[in-house]
């Protein structure tokens, strides 16, 4: 059974895969800012999780998915205020009883320490200092992510 | 309410650096991407540039060699240095704040009301 | 960069009447990324139009914008004393950001 949160994320994800044949992007698009190798855009305005996770698509984006603590960090280094929260692509899955990535994958229990429970209707923020389980309902901000392509040399077989 | 006010000489000599000043008052630096736009007597409008409350800019790819924005946080203010200036130059600068792409509001949805800067020796 | 062309480059018209403006782009306007803005003499702009359709806060329902890829429209369905002045679209999709050379919405 699953929840309407996760419903909502599955079929955004799945719309998502079928237009993301596009060409590489190469550098960051105008308003996004770069990290390492995403290039990220942080609301000024509030949403649910369910809401902010349609606008990243409507972006051709996501929300913010974290790879590790490091990523974490310098993420968190970009929020201004203390008090700020911000939804990321991480809700929980009440079918599968853990949290889970928009992507489908689930969280590394040593990625990221959350404060509050796990269950029902939950969805992550972070903070400048924090990560936190709230109601998905919460109207917070949120960040959305595009990935950088890497640029690799092309090898050219001998003419 | 947030407003924006424009601060500088009237007048720069000709080779010489402009430099505009706009503080924010009423609200936020935070979060929103801070604008310098120039109207020329009679003419339209040109986007100069932007600065985020990171720090991070982007200019105008006709004036970015003459260009710098910075930003001074405590104080709510941004500011424009543009250098080697000519009687090209003068004109009506604004500054705004652009909502960018994501939000209630996009685009420039706040201007100050805006600073003559003529340029002659 | 994107160039916008806008027109008529002045429309003569009576109070009462119904405005139409166009904004070309030189090529497909991101995500609809275009907003419209007033300017009377001696005055800043004022945004009207964001997002192509979207009317910004305080704007009377006279004004709507539509429009997608290159071609958009602003219309004042009833033209008030206080809507004559001169209307910039603008896009904001992509770096640099420009304007339209401008539509002269004047008393005939």
């Known amino acids: 059974q699953k929840s309407s949160i996760e419903k909502c994320s599955v079929d955004i994800q799945q719309s998502r895969n079928k237009t993301t044949e596009r060409p590489g992007l190469l550098n960051c698009p105008i308003y996004w800012q770069q990290l390492r190798e995403k290039c990220l855009l942080f609301s000024h305005t509030v949403n649910p999780w369910n809401n902010s996770l349609a606008d990243c698509s409507t972006k051709e984006s996501s929300l913010l998915l974290i790879r590790d603590k490091d990523e974490l960090i310098h993420t968190q280094n970009l929020i201004r205020d203390k008090a700020i929260l911000f939804w990321i692509g991480l809700n929980f899955s009440l079918s599968e009883k853990n949290w889970k990535w928009i992507n489908g994958s689930f969280l590394n229990s040593n990625d990221l320490e959350i404060r509050g429970d796990a269950k029902e209707n939950s969805c992550i923020s972070i903070s400048q200092t924090s990560v936190y389980s709230e109601y998905c309902s919460t109207e917070i901000r949120w960040i959305c992510q595009k990935e950088l392509t890497p640029v690799r040399n092309k090898v050219y077989p001998d003419s | 309410q947030v407003q924006l006010q424009e601060s500088g000489p009237g007048l720069v000599k000709p080779s010489e650096t402009l430099s505009l000043t706009c503080t924010v008052s009423?609200?936020?630096?935070?979060?929103?991407?801070w604008t310098w736009i120039r109207q020329s007597p009679g003419k339209g409008l040109e986007w100069i540039g932007y600065?985020?409350?990171?720090?991070?800019?982007n200019y105008n790819p006709s004036l970015k060699s003459r260009v710098t924005m910075s930003l001074d946080t405590s104080k709510n203010q941004f500011s424009l240095k543009l250098t080697s200036v000519t009687t090209a130059d003068t004109a009506v600068y604004y500054c705004?704040?652009?909502?960018?792409?994501?939000?209630?509001?996009?685009?420039?949805?706040?201007w100050g009301q805006g600073t003559m800067v003529t340029v002659s020796s | 960069e994107i160039v916008l062309t806008q027109s008529p480059g002045t429309l003569s018209l009576s109070p009462g009447e119904r405005a139409t403006l166009s904004c070309r782009a030189s090529?497909?306007?991101?995500?609809?990324?275009l907003a419209w803005y007033q300017q009377k003499p001696g005055q800043a702009p004022r945004l009207l139009i964001y997002?192509?359709?979207s009317r910004a806060t305080g704007i009377p329902d006279r004004f709507s914008g539509s429009g997608s890829g290159t071609d958009f429209t602003l219309t004042i369905s009833r033209l008030e004393p206080e809507d004559f002045a001169v209307y910039y679209c603008?896009?904001?999709?992509?770096?640099?950001?420009?304007f339209g050379g401008g539509t002269k919405v004047e008393i005939k």
């Open positions: 009423g609200g936020s630096i935070d979060y929103f991407y």
């Open positions: 603008q896009q904001y999709g992509s770096s640099p950001l420009t």
């Open positions: 997002g192509a359709s």
């Open positions: 600065i985020y409350h990171s720090g991070s800019t």
């Open positions: 090529q497909s306007v991101s995500s609809s990324y």
């Open positions: 705004a704040r652009d909502g960018g792409i994501v939000g209630a509001t996009n685009a420039l949805d706040i």
